[in-house]
């Protein structure tokens, strides 16, 4: 069972000292975080019992392991059902507090109540102030049951519940019909999943048989120790004050657990600690009596003394629950109460024993669940014991559950119940995960959800490449961490699997399925250079770069050219498909920006150095096109170009620049300033005759602007070859800009 | 669905003695109170008699008191109202009816048995 | 007391609303919250329509509203309509753990 504990502070005098406290002896426990499960949880739980609201509860969590819940303001806020969550996974346990008003009409004699399929229960409500009216019994919140106030025996109405079973498990309460339900008296009721002394599915299995007054759980077989004992049987008496299944934890205060109610896991429920009794867990043990709610009687025997917290305190010479055993009759020593061995492995179990006549080799045996008896192969006989090793045949998963160590003597006989744990090695349920991969290297999570049992103590990593027949390699890593692949092959598939351990000898898991990764391209290791770059326009840039000179096939698929706008923090990328490639054209550009440039080559997805960067300046956007672009020939060699200013100009025109190209021919565009930027007519001089150009134009202020249209026209036939064409403005001669 | 259904009423003499049974289903006939009430003809309904769940607790009119005994059989299902004693002004329609679980006031109702008590 | 006290008739027309009154003592309707209604059709079995004072059960009609004041409970119908026309009776859990019902009124729908 899950080492869960509900504790509440029953100094009812001010409801703004009660306290709940919940404490969990689970490793991990409350942490919260994905390794170790959820936190715990402490809630009042008001789907049954509603109470008017209130200021919220207060809940303070004290290191990883415990939480209060405090801000109890009056003592309406304490009535009801409060609940404690714990554990993780499968393991999650909900344990339950439910609380009495002192002041009630009707008072529990007994809140929890825990009895067997099959059983009948019985729950007494105490009458405390009377009402002459009928009496309402309530099952989780719902009409149970009526009894005329008549009908009470002794001062108790009682609710008979024949043959229960564990549907009728839950919160139970009889009300006076006219009185506040905060005045009922509530009770819980747990009816274990089998009859009385079995467990397992179909109750089939034999309870350890739990001793002062644990309870058998009906899941697992596990004894749910009362507060104070501990040991796989609640055998063994925890020092006063202490409490955890390992006794391990300690009433806060200086007066120990008084006043403390202790709420642990179903099939237990709630009750004091060991040695106090009372509604409010005040009053001590009478003479005689010992353990949680002083349910238990000690009946010493041979001079021994009754302590009220662990029970016979006996003389030298005796032992045993009542002090019944002579230290002569042989007595099992030092037997562990729980055992954990993985499947199919054959174990060695160690029981030794003492006793007067000395007990020999063959009068210790050890008997399986099933009834099976083993004789020990091998005794190590020593002055105060014998010590009978067990060589146990192949464990299988029946094999869990309770053995015992029996041994007998003409002095008497002794046994001792412990459980064994069988647990099934892991086997990953999926492939481990690639994280990510370089050319020679993988990264890779290994821990994947698994069947069996954990925990997971190691985790091996197997891999080889694909297809390949040779061994496989071998990693060996911690469970919580990623792992990395080194040294392997670039631009090759490796199968990967997953192989997990769980602590003890054959713990080992069968590998988990194979997942194909497979690892990158070589890096590109080549660093280009930019070798210029110019200006095409206010938006465009052409740029060209070089590769060092070395021996061998160019290790790469293209260039990837970064522009970097520093003002606007915006980078623009542009991808050069081919390794052959040595200048690009970059458009569509923010005019007027400045530019870190750099280029680098890729292969695959990896990405080479990145060259030296350049700083570029774009030019501001220039103004709008000039309109109305009309060319008419003058003579075999001359031209002229009329056309009208651009509108909503951003400034003064500096000039235009005209581009002269021959119609069709492969040849470079010409390029002419216009240096008047008055004038809206220009001729261009010395073109060849009969021959058809393109003519566009376009304005600059600070940056050359958009194009105007183009236009075409013919020079007149028959004349000389001239040496090029020229402009001329109002007879003004201008040379050209190429 | 809740059903109640009564039965045993006939012509009875004065001074005579008749009981009345309800068979019910449909709810858990054993966790709820019970009552009878009748209706002499022409006339307003009158509460006769109520019995716990357990059978241990009883109540009577006035009227009736020391004459009627109101009892169950939990194992049938079964309400009975045994009458002795019958007057003229016991005629009436007898109806068997359930109490609401955890208050005053009857949800279900039988069609009713009619008693008449003549000479 | 036997009985609870009503009116034996309230009639009104359609779409009107009245009220019927019943009227008991501090050991009836005055000491507790559990008067309820019941309407009764020529010749059939009583129907609850109002239980614990004000409440009603799932089906009823929310035109049929009950209220208490002091010793004297009341229901109103409101919108009234042809086949509001019944007996009705109010009853009331008493101090000796016992029910008493009232004499009943006969509502006509004019």
């Known amino acids: 069972a899950v080492d869960l504990t509900l504790l509440a502070n029953l100094r009812l005098t001010d409801p703004q000292r009660f306290f709940l406290t919940c404490v969990s002896g689970e490793a991990g426990a409350g942490r919260g975080s994905d390794a170790w499960g959820p936190p715990l949880l402490l809630e009042k739980d008001d789907r049954i019992v509603r109470t008017p609201p209130g200021p919220p509860l207060r809940l303070a969590r004290n290191g990883s392991h415990q939480v209060t819940l405090r801000g109890f303001s009056k003592p309406s806020d304490l009535v009801g059902v409060f609940s404690c969550v714990g554990g993780a996974g499968a393991r999650r346990t909900r344990v339950i507090y439910v609380h009495n008003s002192p002041g009630a009409h009707l008072l529990p004699d007994k809140v929890t109540h825990t009895v067997n399929k099959g059983d009948t229960a019985v729950l007494s409500a105490r009458v405390h102030k009377e009402k002459q009216t009928d009496v309402i019994w309530k099952s989780n919140g719902s009409y149970f049951y009526t009894l005329d106030w008549h009908e009470a025996q002794d001062g108790r109405f009682l609710l008979q519940l024949p043959n229960v079973q564990p549907p009728s498990s839950g919160i139970y309460s009889a009300t006076y019909l006219e009185a506040s339900p905060l005045g009922s008296a509530f009770f819980r009721l747990i009816v274990r999943g089998c009859g009385a002394g079995r467990w397992g599915p179909g109750c089939t299995k034999e309870c350890p048989g739990c001793l002062h007054g644990g309870v058998c759980h009906d899941h697992d077989g596990e004894c749910v120790c009362p507060p104070g004992f501990t040991g796989t049987r609640c055998e063994q008496a925890c020092r006063e004050g202490r409490f955890g299944q390992s006794c391990q934890e300690q009433c806060p205060g200086i007066s120990g657990c008084r006043g403390l109610t202790f709420c642990l896991p179903d099939p237990y429920g709630c009750s004091c600690g060991s040695g106090w009794r009372g509604s409010q867990c005040q009053e001590a043990c009478a003479p005689g009596h010992f353990g949680a709610d002083c349910r238990l009687q000690c009946q010493c025997q041979n001079g021994g003394t009754c302590d009220r917290f662990s029970g016979c305190v006996c003389p030298s010479g005796w032992h045993g629950v009542h002090c019944e055993k002579s230290d002569r009759i042989p007595q099992i020593l030092n037997m562990a109460s729980e055992l954990e061995f993985n499947l199919e492995t054959m174990p060695r179990i160690n029981c030794a024993a003492a006793g007067n006549p000395f007990p020999v080799r063959g009068s210790i045996e050890l008997r399986k669940p099933d009834g099976t008896v083993l004789l020990s192969t091998k005794a190590i006989v020593e002055p105060e014991k014998t010590t009978a090793e067990f060589e146990v045949p192949r464990l299988v998963l029946a094999d869990s559950g309770f053995w015992e160590c029996r041994v007998s003597t003409s002095g008497g006989q002794d046994s001792r119940r412990f459980k064994v744990n069988v647990k099934v090695p892991p086997v990953p349920l999926a492939a481990p995960r690639l994280l990510t991969k370089q050319s020679r290297q993988l990264v890779v999570s290994p821990l994947v959800s698994f069947s069996g049992d954990g925990p997971i103590s190691t985790v091996r990593l197997h891999y080889r490449p694909q297809d390949s027949t040779m061994d496989w390699s071998t990693i060996v890593v911690d469970p919580s961490e990623n792992v990395t692949l080194m040294n392997l092959r670039p631009k090759t598939g490796y199968s990967v699997r997953v192989q997990l351990s769980r602590p003890g000898e054959g713990g080992e898991g069968a590998w988990g399925p194979p997942t194909l990764m497979t690892t990158d391209c070589p890096e590109p290791l080549l660093q280009p250079w930019l070798e210029g770059w110019h200006v095409e326009g206010t938006d465009r840039l052409r740029v060209s770069w070089s590769l060092p000179l070395v021996p061998g096939p160019l290790v790469g698929d293209g260039f990837l050219l970064r522009l970097w706008d520093g003002t606007r923090g915006q980078e623009r990328r542009e991808n050069v498909s081919s390794p052959q490639a040595r200048t690009a054209l970059l458009t569509g550009l923010t005019p007027g920006t400045h530019y870190q440039l750099d280029v680098q080559l890729y292969h695959c997805t990896l990405l080479g150095p990145a060259s030296p960067p350049a700083h570029v300046l774009l030019p501001p956007s220039g103004p709008p096109a000039p309109r109305h672009l009309h060319a008419q020939a003058l003579s075999d060699s001359e031209i002229q170009l009329t056309w009208k200013h651009p509108e909503a100009l951003p400034g003064p025109i500096s000039k235009y620049v005209v581009e002269v190209q021959v119609a069709g021919g492969a040849g470079d565009p010409l390029w002419i300033d216009v240096d008047r930027p008055e004038e809206t007519s220009t001729i261009i001089r010395g073109l060849n005759a009969s021959t058809r150009y393109l003519f566009r134009m376009r304005a600059s202020i600070q940056g050359l602007g958009d194009w105007s249209n183009t236009v075409e026209e013919s020079t007149l036939g028959n004349g000389l070859q001239a040496e090029g064409p020229v402009q001329e403005s109002r007879a003004a001669e201008e040379g050209l800009d190429q | 669905e809740v059903q109640l259904l009564e039965s045993g009423g006939g012509l009875v003499q004065p001074g005579g003695s008749l009981r009345l049974s309800c068979a019910a289903s449909?709810?858990?006939?054993?966790?709820?109170?019970m009552s009878w009430v009748r209706q002499a003809p022409g006339k307003g309904l009158e509460w006769v008699s109520r019995?716990?769940?357990?059978?241990?607790?009883?109540r009577y009119a006035d009227s009736v008191k020391g004459r009627f005994t109101i009892s169950r059989d939990n194992s049938k299902n079964t309400l009975y109202l045994q009458m002795n004693s019958l007057r003229a002004e016991d005629t009436a329609v007898y109806y068997c009816?359930?109490?609401?679980?955890?208050?005053?006031?009857?949800?279900?109702w039988g069609q009713g048995t009619l008693v008449t008590v003549s000479s | 007391q036997s009985e609870l006290t009503q009116p034996a008739s309230v009639s009104g027309s359609p779409g009107q609303s009245i009220t019927i009154s019943c009227t008991g003592t501090t050991s009836d309707v005055g000491g507790y919250n559990y008067v309820s209604w019941y309407q009764q059709d020529p010749g059939k079995v009583p129907k609850l329509i109002i239980y614990?004072?004000?409440n009603r059960p799932s089906g009823v009609s929310n035109r049929f509203s009950g209220s208490k004041s002091g010793n004297t409970a009341s229901l109103t119908i409101s919108g009234l309509r042809a086949e509001d026309e019944a007996d009705y009776y109010c009853?009331?859990?008493?101090?000796?753990?016992?029910?008493?019902f009232g004499t009943g009124t006969k509502v006509t729908v004019l």
């Open positions: 614990e004072v004000y």
């Open positions: 019995i716990y769940p357990s059978g241990g607790g009883t």
């Open positions: 449909g709810f858990t006939f054993s966790a709820y109170v």
């Open positions: 009853s009331s859990k008493t101090s000796s753990v016992t029910y008493v």
């Open positions: 009816a359930k109490e609401a679980g955890g208050s005053y006031f009857l949800d279900y």
